[in-house]
């Protein structure tokens, strides 16, 4: 017979967990003993089953773990794992601090969408990567010309909405342009908005004429000469 002991104490060295609100937290207390010990959890010294917690908790006894998803400020506290068997018991305290993030305008990854050059008839993907605490919505816009002008009397550009979606729908951050033609050339804007405000970045698509397959086949190396 053997009292409980920690099997991976090096994985338990991080005592203080300071986590942004909305993130997932996982506490682990991997242990062993003979007989095999049981694990239970306390929050601030009281038995913790997560029944009062929105979203509940996940206890994975075989992994000696406690998982809380989408943490909120009320989850702050001291979490104790109590591991015991008939021979003895051990405990370990984790401290959880939940950091309240300030919701901000969407942040767009620098350099996206990127300026792109394509050949007539090819397919193009324009990417836009968005970081936002508040759920963002995205629009892909194409800048267009009306009566020979790109701008209205108010000084703002003429734009056409190509695609609108919320970020959680699939492929919302990618604009697919199939079988591009010369008319597809121009400026494209990825616009992301949330309850705080809007952010947008633009890129240019250049469409080159279709290559002559005969010329390409006859002198392929010519494409790489200066």
């Amino acid at each position: 017979q053997q009292a409980p002991y920690w099997t991976h104490p090096q994985r338990m060295e991080k005592k203080l967990h300071a986590v942004p609100a909305g993130n997932t937290v996982k506490f682990r207390c991997p242990a062993a003993g003979n007989p095999t010990p049981t694990i239970r959890w306390l929050k601030d010294g009281q038995a913790f089953h997560g029944e009062n917690r929105i979203g509940g908790i996940r206890l994975r006894h075989q992994h000696w773990s406690l998982v809380m998803e989408s943490v909120v400020p009320s989850d702050r506290g001291t979490y104790t794992c109590l591991v015991e068997n008939a021979v003895g018991s051990i405990r370990y305290n984790y401290l959880l601090d939940v950091l309240e993030r300030s919701p901000h305008r969407p942040i767009l990854q620098a350099g996206l969408p990127a300026n792109t050059t394509a050949v007539v008839g090819s397919d193009v993907e324009l990417l836009c990567k968005v970081y936002s605490d508040a759920q963002p919505h995205i629009q892909w816009l194409k800048h267009i010309v009306i009566n020979g002008s790109s701008f209205g009397a108010d000084g703002f550009p003429y734009v056409q909405v190509l695609k609108t979606a919320d970020i959680n729908s699939s492929e919302v951050e990618v604009l697919y342009l199939r079988n591009v033609s010369a008319e597809d050339a121009g400026e494209y804007t990825c616009l992301a908005g949330n309850s705080i405000g809007l952010s947008y970045q633009s890129a240019w698509l250049t469409v080159l004429p279709e290559e002559d397959p005969t010329w390409t086949a006859a002198a392929p190396e010519a494409r790489y000469t200066d």
Epitope: P103, R105, Q135, F156, V161, T189, I196, G197
Partner: antibody, heavy 124, light 112 residues
Framework: EVQLLESGGGVVQPGRSLRLSCAAS????????MHWVRQAPGKGLEWVAV????????YYADSVKGRFTISRDNSKNTLSLQMNSLRVEDTAIYYC?????????????????WGQGTMVTVSS | DIVMTQTPLSLSVTPGQPASISCRSS???????????VYWYVQKSGQPPQLLIY???NRFSGVPDRFSGSGSRTDFTLKISRVEAEDVGVYYC?????????FGGGTKVEIK
């Protein structure tokens, strides 16, 4: 004409509740986030809360968190602010303000249109 | 929270003379999209605030060109090139980059 018109203000005792409304007209209300901003007598401006265009996201100033609830009814073009457990320090003019829209910003992306405000006085 | 500090508290200006109001933010208001999200308002007696300048230096529609905004990152200035009697009011700067949105304490402009 783009317009925001607040109502529901009045005199109320500390600890009581009040519900403010803001009627929007002249623009597609359901496409804009909306804010409440307040101003205590003789003081500066303080942001209170925001709600996203579809009502799915709401954020509050720490001073009102847990007491005030912002909501909207897009079918009626109406923004609301439910104020519970009112305190003397909540006494202010409450302004309804248009926030960011969903499309390309032809000008500022919000905080361009303000209502005339409604006065809330919390006093015993 | 981002703190907006405005100076001076009040300003008495002779008509036709210039006026300048400063605003400092505790964090940079330059966003990843290259825009600086500081707004300027004037509030005239008994009225709601009116937008003058957005995104650092853009004049809102209908705002006279004697009003201009400038600055970078954390230091911002609103200038009135030639003050007129109708410019009397309290001027506020505001950061519009993250919640809670915050305002400067205000600068009261009066005519000498």
């Amino acid at each position: 004409e783009v317009q925001l018109l607040e109502s529901g203000g009045g005199v109320v005792q500390p600890g009581r509740s009040l519900r403010l409304s803001c009627a929007a007209s002249g623009f597609t209300f359901s496409s804009y986030a909306m804010h409440w901003v307040r101003q205590a007598p003789g003081k500066g401006l303080e942001w209170v809360a925001v709600i996203s265009y579809d009502g799915s996201n709401k954020y509050y100033a720490d001073s009102v968190k847990g007491r005030f609830t912002i909501s909207r009814d897009n079918s009626k073009n109406t923004l609301s602010l439910q104020m519970n457990s009112l305190r003397v320090e909540d006494t202010a003019i409450y302004y309804c303000v248009r926030g960011a829209g969903r499309g390309f910003p032809y000008g500022p992306d919000g905080f361009d249109i303000w209502g005339q405000g409604t006065m809330v006085t919390v006093s015993s | 929270d981002i703190v907006m500090t405005q100076t001076p508290l009040s300003l008495s200006v002779t008509p036709g003379q210039p006026a300048s109001i400063s605003c400092r933010s505790s964090r940079s208001l330059l966003h990843s999209d290259g825009k600086t999200y500081v707004y300027w308002y004037v509030q005239k007696s008994g009225q709601p605030p009116q937008l003058l300048i957005y995104e650092l230096s853009n004049r809102f529609s209908g705002v006279p060109d004697r009003f201009s905004g400038s600055g970078s990152r954390t230091d911002f200035t609103l200038k009135i090139s030639r003050v007129e009697a109708e410019d009397v009011g309290v001027y506020y700067c505001m950061q519009y980059i993250e919640a809670p949105l915050t305002f400067g304490g205000g600068t009261k402009v009066e005519i000498k």
